[in-house]
């Protein structure tokens, strides 16, 4: 067979001759690549548009279920049921009544455990005899704690005024043992439900100065739409304590975030909030009950810069001139000031309620559930933006004895800061925690 000299077939080829010429790469790209690129770009555009629509919808609208429809986000938590099933009023600040008396409490006398006899209404000190880890856990669970407690024996003091009884457990509540004889050990139960109130650094006693998060690892910034609104205090891995009035303008839970672990306002990641709970409002005392608990979506991991502060003891009565500390990112001047970027700290002292209620001061507005703190000559005070933050007292540990609440102006000599007295709300705090366990 003669070979066609014009043939494209190589001489050594054993291949069958192609029926048509192969496409050059440019032609293939034009016919296959371009449509794929166009399809991918279209898909990317659609995805971007969908994401943008979703972002815009999420920012400005809320999706109601059954039937599916959108309502403006400003209608969330406005006190009106705008969704047929009322979901728009679901994730809002909720109120919780004070509830029944919690039948256990801890005294400032070495954190000793006291138990209520509900039949008589009398309180008794817990004897260390036969006191177990299980009983310690029950006591702490009654106060709403979920962490592992520690306890030890402490000697009965000479000024022990309550009867001392042996303790038992009945349907997950501590009870007095019926046949309780004398306390043979001669010791009371000192109970700690949570390791709290310890910081890496002790503050120096000066006027107002920049603070370090090492000194105040429980301080948080409570923010709405990334803007600092209030301070707050970490009480345990799930809970932050603050003031109810912080949520006055925005009662939806969605946009509130908590920032912990830094003394600089903008520099730390935000934590999602699951619930915001305030105490049932009493119309007769509208300034009372300025207290709120924020439940975090995920528990905090404690570290050197993120730690809880202790709640006060039920009998924590602070006398006038007792030294206390305040911290916050609030206004540095009463008028025309701006929020501080750096956490500030100051030493103040308890101011007698009678003095605080005088005619040239608060004229009787400071109730038994509030306390005043400042310095007699004025000039050192909490201000706008400090609200919700802690008023702190140091014994063995740091305790949050007050919550920054209200005042006339900032730093006036006759009108010091007014604080929610935390010890007046221990029962409410424990009842909230128990309900959320």
């Amino acid at each position: 067979m003669l070979q066609d000299p014009d043939s494209d077939q190589p001489l050594n080829s054993l291949d069958v001759k192609p029926l048509r010429k192969p496409r050059i790469p440019m032609e293939t790209f034009r016919k296959v690549g371009i449509p794929i690129i166009i399809a991918l770009l279209s898909l990317a555009s659609i995805i971007i548009v969908v994401v943008l629509i979703k972002v815009i919808l999420d920012k400005y609208y809320f999706l109601c279920g059954q039937p599916l429809h959108f309502i403006p986000r400003k209608q969330l938590c406005d006190g009106e049921l705008d969704c047929p099933l009322g979901e728009d009023e679901e994730h809002c600040v909720k109120s919780f009544p004070e509830g029944p008396a919690v039948a256990v409490r801890l005294s400032k006398d070495r954190s000793t455990l006291q138990v209520l006899d509900s039949a008589t209404g009398n309180w008794f000190s817990a004897c260390f005899d036969n006191f177990t880890e299980a009983l310690a856990e029950t006591a702490c669970r009654q106060m709403g704690y979920s962490s592992k407690p520690t306890f030890r024996a402490v000697e009965i003091g000479p000024d022990q005024d309550l009867d001392v009884v042996e303790i038992t457990e009945n349907s997950q509540e501590l009870r007095m043992r019926n046949s309780s004889g004398p306390c043979l050990s001669g010791s009371l139960v000192s109970l700690h439900c949570l390791a709290c109130g310890k910081s890496l650094k002790t503050p120096r006693v000066v006027g107002v100065e920049e603070a370090s998060v090492d000194s105040w690892p429980w301080q948080v910034s409570i923010q709405y739409d990334k803007q600092h609104v209030c301070g707050g205090s970490i009480l345990d891995p799930h809970w932050v304590l603050t003031a109810a009035h912080c949520f006055r303008k925005h009662t939806d839970v969605f946009n509130w975030k908590v920032r912990a672990g830094s003394d600089k306002l903008g520099s730390f990641p935000s934590l999602a909030v699951a619930k915001i709970i305030i105490i049932e409002f009493n119309p007769m005392y509208p300034k009372d009950n300025d207290i709120a608990l924020m439940k975090l979506q995920f528990p905090l991991t404690f570290s050197g810069t993120v730690r809880p502060i202790c709640l006060p003891f039920f009998d924590e009565e602070l006398t006038p001139a007792t030294p206390l500390w305040i911290i916050g990112w609030g206004f540095t001047k009463q008028n025309g000031g701006k929020m501080s970027d750096i956490l500030l700290q100051a030493s103040v002292q308890v101011i007698d309620s009678t003095r605080c209620n005088a005619d040239d001061a608060y004229q009787g507005e400071v109730t038994e559930k509030m306390m005043c703190a400042g310095i007699p000559e004025g000039g050192v005070d909490t201000c706008q933006g400090d609200s919700g933050g802690p008023l702190m007292y140091q014994s063995d540990q740091w305790h949050v004895v007050g919550i920054v609440s209200w005042g006339y102006g900032c730093g006036g000599p006759s009108t010091p800061g007014v604080y929610t007295k935390v010890s007046a709300y221990l029962n409410w705090i424990y009842n909230v925690w128990k309900a959320e366990l």
Epitope: G79, E280, P286
Partner: antibody
Framework: EVQLLESGGGLVQPGGSLRLSCAAS????????MHWVRQAPGKGLEWVSS????????HYADSVKGRFTISRDNSKNTLYLQMNSLRAEDTAVYYC????????????????WGQGTLVTVSS | DIQMTQSPSSLSASVGDRVTITCRAS??????LAWYQQKPGKAPKLLIY???SLQSGVPSRFSGSGSGTDFTLTISSLQPEDFATYYC?????????FGQGTKVEIK
């Protein structure tokens, strides 16, 4: 839409009794404190009584203390005012009113009112 | 109880007029003051709270100002539907107390 609808008003003799009801809808009734406020013919508004969201706190004006009883049933979304030993000066339109959730001071501001029910005390 | 005094007790005005009503408290109520509008045979309606905050859905021609003991409600341009009686209420101290009302009539 928030709605408060009062009922139970009417003509009663001095010393008689009436029970006013207020049916609430369009909001989470159990989350709000409520007031009763009255308005005598041609006169201004006068606060009568308040009740907190879970009935923990109850308050009365001195003029009705011991004679009127405020209560609520959150399961029925209803507020009540039991009025005993009625006097001529209790003649008024009685409004059921929702206390706005303005946390902190100023919390006894009313954000919604019912249409009112007329109570006439006359022999 | 804190006494609330409104002035004037009545006024006549025309559509488009600027109307000002004042309310004075017998002692400081800070900014805890509300203004309500009531039309004959109707329930009162909240216009202003916290002395100057406009309630949702209320026209912007209504504005409030003041703090302490002296407060003002202003209607920048009176409309036909604004002819009504206006009440102030303090919410600082319990019990809540109301002014005696200001009736705005057509001139």
């Amino acid at each position: 839409e928030v709605q408060l609808l009062e009922s139970g008003g009417g003509l009663v003799q001095p010393g008689g009794s009436l029970r006013l009801s207020c049916a609430a809808s369009g909001f989470t009734f159990s989350s709000y404190a409520m007031h009763w406020v009255r308005q005598a013919p041609g006169k201004g508004l006068e606060w009568v009584s308040s009740i907190s969201s879970s009935s923990t706190y109850i308050h009365y004006a001195d003029s009705v203390k011991g004679r009127f009883t405020i209560s609520r049933d959150n399961s029925k979304n209803t507020l009540y005012l039991q009025m005993n030993s009625l006097r001529a000066e209790d003649t008024a339109v009685y409004y059921c009113a929702r206390v706005g959730r303005y946390y902190g001071s100023g919390s006894s501001l009313v954000d919604y009112w019912g249409q009112g029910t007329l109570v006439t005390v006359s022999s | 109880d804190i006494q609330m005094t409104q002035s004037p007790s009545s006024l006549s005005a025309s559509v488009g007029d600027r109307v000002t009503i004042t309310c004075r408290a017998s002692q400081s109520v800070s900014s805890w003051l509300a203004w309500y509008q009531q039309k004959p045979g109707k329930a009162p309606k909240l216009l202003i709270y916290d002395a100057s905050s406009l309630q949702s859905g209320v026209p912007s021609r209504f504005s409030g100002s003041g703090s302490g003991t002296d407060f003002t409600l202003t209607i920048s341009s009176l409309q036909p539907e604004d002819f009504a009686t206006y009440y102030c209420q303090q919410a600082k101290s319990f019990p809540p107390t109301f002014g005696q009302g200001t009736k705005v009539e057509i001139k």
